[in-house]
């Protein structure tokens, strides 16, 4: 019982975690205008990842797209790469997941393909929250640089124009979804984790009988007993998490692809 | 079409208040923030406040935060701007205008001459 | 407060003849997001309400005859009438539409020769 609500608790999560992801990835307010210096202004800038906004106290929003790829920084390319590969995964993830569910019978499923359904979900949810709070940690960190080299640009005095005509920005609303959402994938990837541990059959362990031989008291016990017993050191789920930090790595390396696109 | 008709002229003494009323239609007025703008004889011109009737929501100048408030009727399509506190220096023409995209004031009212004298 | 100078005051042009007003802001109205300049232009006949001519520096509003353009970016902008008409005669006015308070300049008055 603890095993199902487990599962079906790390399913919700990430089911709500990877929507998060969704909603950050489409919102526009990836960064806002830092009011500090102008806190009066009639027009008010945000950008996202796909568009920039311009919102004029007269009510109205303007929004154009990047529509270049090409002229568009390696550093919101990577960004943009790590969210969508994070709602893939996590698309995949759930797909899986729904399969897995010990609540759902699918005709004569066994109950071990249910525990490695949910251990490849599991895996591809922590992967896909990893891959959302790397992606919105990359853009944050990237606006507190630009935020303090135009800092230092309005004090340093780089011509009249530049202090008048650069816009700072700061962390917007996306950014917070992103890490939340992203964290939530994480923890619901982690639960299906450990409800797989509850989900996969303990294999029939013989006991251990003791045989008492003439003048002697040693206890002999069948040579297979420790390497088939359950989760204890098996390498074949060794391997598997092995694999999920492979795909890990894979998927933190992969933007760097298109760095030069 | 849009139009924005004013009360008419008015005549006050000094340390008295004044209301003036701006009454849009052609429309929709709930969406539209409404500006308050004066005008002294032979002087320019000098943005007052305005308001988002939709919420209420208010934004003033500076110099007239403490004396002006506007104020909107939804169901009258009507906005108010009341001056406290009247002053000879006061006496102006006090036109209404429509804030539009650009943050431009497109439409404006006919104008409401205030006097003040005692 | 953004500070709006016109010049001149006042201005006296021929029939004909192509009248430049200035405006210079104490700030950049120059928004970076969309690389527009918040600053728009009015025309005020005697005895009437102002009228919008050009936003954005150089947009001319619907209906404004084409002998009306705005030019300028950041600090520096120009209204250039390019062959003055009787009905033009009025005063102009610039206004901020970049920042609070909403400002105008102090207005410049076109006059025929």
């Known amino acids: 019982m603890a095993v199902t609500a487990c599962q079906g608790l790390g399913f919700v999560v990430s089911l709500i975690g990877i929507a998060g992801i969704i909603a950050a990835t489409c919102m526009d307010q990836w960064s806002t205008q830092d009011l500090y210096n102008n806190p009066v202004t009639a027009v008010f800038n945000y950008q996202g990842l796909w568009r920039s906004c311009v919102r004029e106290s007269s009510g109205f929003t303007e929004c154009r797209g990047y529509f270049t790829l090409l002229g568009l920084p390696a550093m919101l390319q990577a960004v943009r790469a790590l969210m969508i590969v994070g709602i893939v995964l996590g698309a995949i993830g759930l797909l899986v997941s729904i399969f897995a569910l010990k609540c759902i019978r699918i005709g004569s499923m066994e109950d071990s393909a249910k525990a490695n359904m949910t251990l490849t979900s599991g895996i591809m949810f922590i992967v896909s929250g990893l891959c959302a709070i790397a992606g919105v940690s990359v853009f944050a960190n990237m606006l507190v640089t630009n935020f303090w080299m135009s800092t230092a640009n309005m004090y340093t005095g780089m011509g009249g124009m530049v202090q008048t005509v650069q816009t700072r920005y700061t962390f917007g609303a996306a950014l917070f979804v992103g890490w939340v959402a992203g964290g939530l994938t994480l923890i619901g990837g982690v639960m299906m984790c450990i409800a797989c541990r509850g989900l996969a059959p303990e294999e029939t362990n013989y006991k251990a009988v003791s045989y008492h031989a003439s003048g002697h008291s040693v206890a002999y016990k069948p040579g297979g007993f420790k390497a088939s017993t359950g989760f204890g050191s098996n390498t074949k789920n060794k391997k598997i998490y092995d694999g999920g930090a492979r795909t890990e790595d894979e998927v933190q390396s992969y933007p760097s692809k298109h760095d030069y696109v | 079409q849009v139009q924005l008709v004013q009360s008419g002229a008015e005549v006050k003494k000094p340390g008295s208040s004044v209301k003036v009323s701006c009454k849009a239609s052609?429309?929709?007025?709930?969406?539209?923030?409404m500006n308050w703008v004066r005008q002294a004889p032979g002087q320019g011109l000098e943005w007052m406040g305005q308001i988002y009737p939709g919420n209420g929501d208010t934004k003033y100048s500076g110099k007239f935060n403490s004396r002006v408030t506007i104020t909107a009727d939804k169901s009258t399509n009507t906005a108010y701007m009341e001056l406290s506190s009247l002053r000879s220096e006061d006496t102006a023409v006090y036109y209404c205008?429509?804030?539009?995209?650009?943050?431009?004031?497109?439409?404006w009212g006919q104008g409401t001459l205030v006097t003040v004298s005692s | 407060d953004i500070v709006l100078t016109q010049s001149p005051d006042s201005l006296a042009v021929s029939l004909g003849e192509r009248a430049t007003i200035n405006c210079k802001s104490s700030?950049?109205?120059?928004?970076?997001?969309?690389?527009?300049?918040?600053l728009t232009w009015y025309q005020q006949k005697p005895g009437q309400p102002p009228k919008l001519l050009i936003y954005w520096a150089s947009t001319r509003e619907s209906g404004v005859p084409d002998r009306f353009s705005g030019s300028g970016s950041g600090t520096d902008f120009t209204l250039t009438i390019s062959s003055l008409q009787a009905e033009d005669l009025a005063v102009y006015y610039c206004q901020n539409g970049y920042s609070y308070p909403l400002t105008f300049g102090q207005g410049t008055k076109l006059e025929i020769k």
């Open positions: 205008a429509r804030f539009y995209y650009g943050n431009v004031m497109d439409y």
């Open positions: 700030q950049t109205l120059l928004n970076g997001g969309n690389q527009k300049n918040y």
């Open positions: 052609g429309y929709a007025f709930s969406n539209y923030w």
